[in-house]
């Protein structure tokens, strides 16, 4: 499956779009710093096979989603920007999606790669539950919106490398 | 087949520590959070505490944090409750139970141990 | 804490009946409802998650519903199997939280 070029241009503009969603510094921030656990050996591809990868983009595409198009996103977060950001996942999805479809098919792709698939929702989960605990304050949204940044980018190295191996 | 097997029954006295276990087996262990249940004979059901095995990042319930603790041993997929000291007031079953995670965040206890019996008395 | 409060607290019921029994959160918890069934003397065992979605293996005749702060469990037809405790549960806050057990015994 190729992903199309557009794809790559709509992780570059999703990254740009979580930059400008930036309100405060990150200095002031430093003391909510979290280590969420980011489930690196996801993203290393020695182990894996394509349609698991896409697999597990999928999943963290989908729960980045998840995350900004909460009513306590909205409130925190530049709305127009919002907007664009949601648009240009929606289509990394549906890429990914006709993707999955065509690497391993309808029936299999959810169970196969069920491990790396619940590393992604765990690390989401404590996301979420850190904003919880926050309550959802405007540094705890600069520090899981700086954590994004840094997963989305681990995630676009990911899919430049399985481009290479093409 | 995705298997909890828990120790066998404990008796103890007040002030006593103990240690029980819950060994996982049939998954991948690191890919989902177990935790403990209480049941007190007779009574419901009340939620303690988890842990995520892969980094044994834990949450506790605040009613239950302080007095015990849970642990992992990643190379024997085995889960652990222990207690410093315990009282009359923690004769229980107690359950290990396995959580699993929809793609909307919620958790859920899919599948669980047989129970370890712990009577406490003096 | 989230409270969950089922009714009622026990029910009686013949071979074939329908049931239903309720739970209520003490606030809303989205569909972050779950249901569990304990025979006499074994663990409890997942009937229903998120609400309304049957765990594998677990009969139709148990459905569930609702969201926010109401949900039901209603089996029909029951089976002399089906004659245990009932426990909802929220996974939405923590604690995550039980509700206080309905016992359906036979009429």
């Known amino acids: 499956c190729d992903l199309p070029q557009t794809h790559s241009l709509g992780n570059r503009r999703a990254l740009i779009l979580l930059a400008q969603m930036r309100r405060i510094s990150p200095f002031s921030c430093l003391k909510d710093r979290h280590d969420f656990e980011f489930p690196q050996e996801e993203f290393d591809d020695k182990q894996f096979q394509k349609a698991q990868a896409i697999s597990v983009l999928h999943e963290m595409i989908q729960q980045t989603f998840n995350l900004f198009s909460t009513k306590d996103s909205s409130a925190a977060l530049d709305e127009t920007l919002l907007d664009e950001f949601y648009i240009e996942l929606d289509q990394q999805l549906n890429d990914l999606e006709s993707c999955v479809m065509q690497e391993v098919g309808v029936i299999e792709s959810p169970l196969m790669y069920e491990d790396s698939i619940l590393a992604v929702r765990k690390y989401f989960q404590r996301i979420t539950l850190y904003l919880t605990e926050k309550k959802y304050s405007s540094c705890a949204w600069e520090v899981v919106r700086a954590e994004i940044m840094r997963s989305f980018s681990l995630s676009i190295n990911l899919q430049k490398r399985l481009k290479s191996k093409e | 087949e995705v298997q909890l097997v828990q120790a066998g029954a404990e008796v103890k006295a007040p002030g006593e520590s103990l240690r029980i276990s819950c060994k996982v087996s049939?998954?991948?262990?690191?890919?989902?959070?177990i935790s403990w249940v209480r049941q007190i004979p007779g009574k419901g059901l009340e939620w303690m505490v988890k842990i995520d095995p892969r980094d044994s990042y834990t949450i506790y319930n605040p009613s239950f944090q302080g007095h015990v603790s849970i642990s992992v041993d990643k190379s024997i997929t085995t889960v652990y409750l222990q207690w410093s000291s315990l009282q009359a007031s923690d004769t229980a079953i107690y359950y290990c139970v396995r959580h699993y995670l929809t793609q909307s965040l919620v958790d859920y206890f899919d599948h669980w141990g047989q129970g370890t019996l712990v009577a406490v008395s003096s | 804490d989230i409270q969950m409060t089922q009714s009622p607290s026990s029910l009686s019921a013949s071979v074939g009946d329908s049931v239903t029994i309720t739970c209520r959160a003490s606030?809303?918890?989205?569909?972050?409802f779950h249901w569990y069934r304990q025979k006499p003397g074994k663990a409890p065992e997942l009937l229903i998650y998120s609400a309304s979605n049957l765990q594998t293996g677990v009969p139709s005749r148990f459905t569930g519903s609702g969201s926010g702060t109401e949900c039901t469990l209603t089996i029909t037809s029951l089976q002399p199997d089906d004659f245990a405790t009932y426990y909802c549960?929220?996974?939405?806050?923590?604690?995550?939280?039980f509700g206080q057990g309905t016992k359906l015994d036979v009429r």
């Open positions: 049939g998954y991948t262990f690191t890919s989902y959070w």
């Open positions: 549960q929220q996974t939405h806050g923590y604690p995550f939280t």
């Open positions: 606030q809303s918890v989205s569909n972050y």
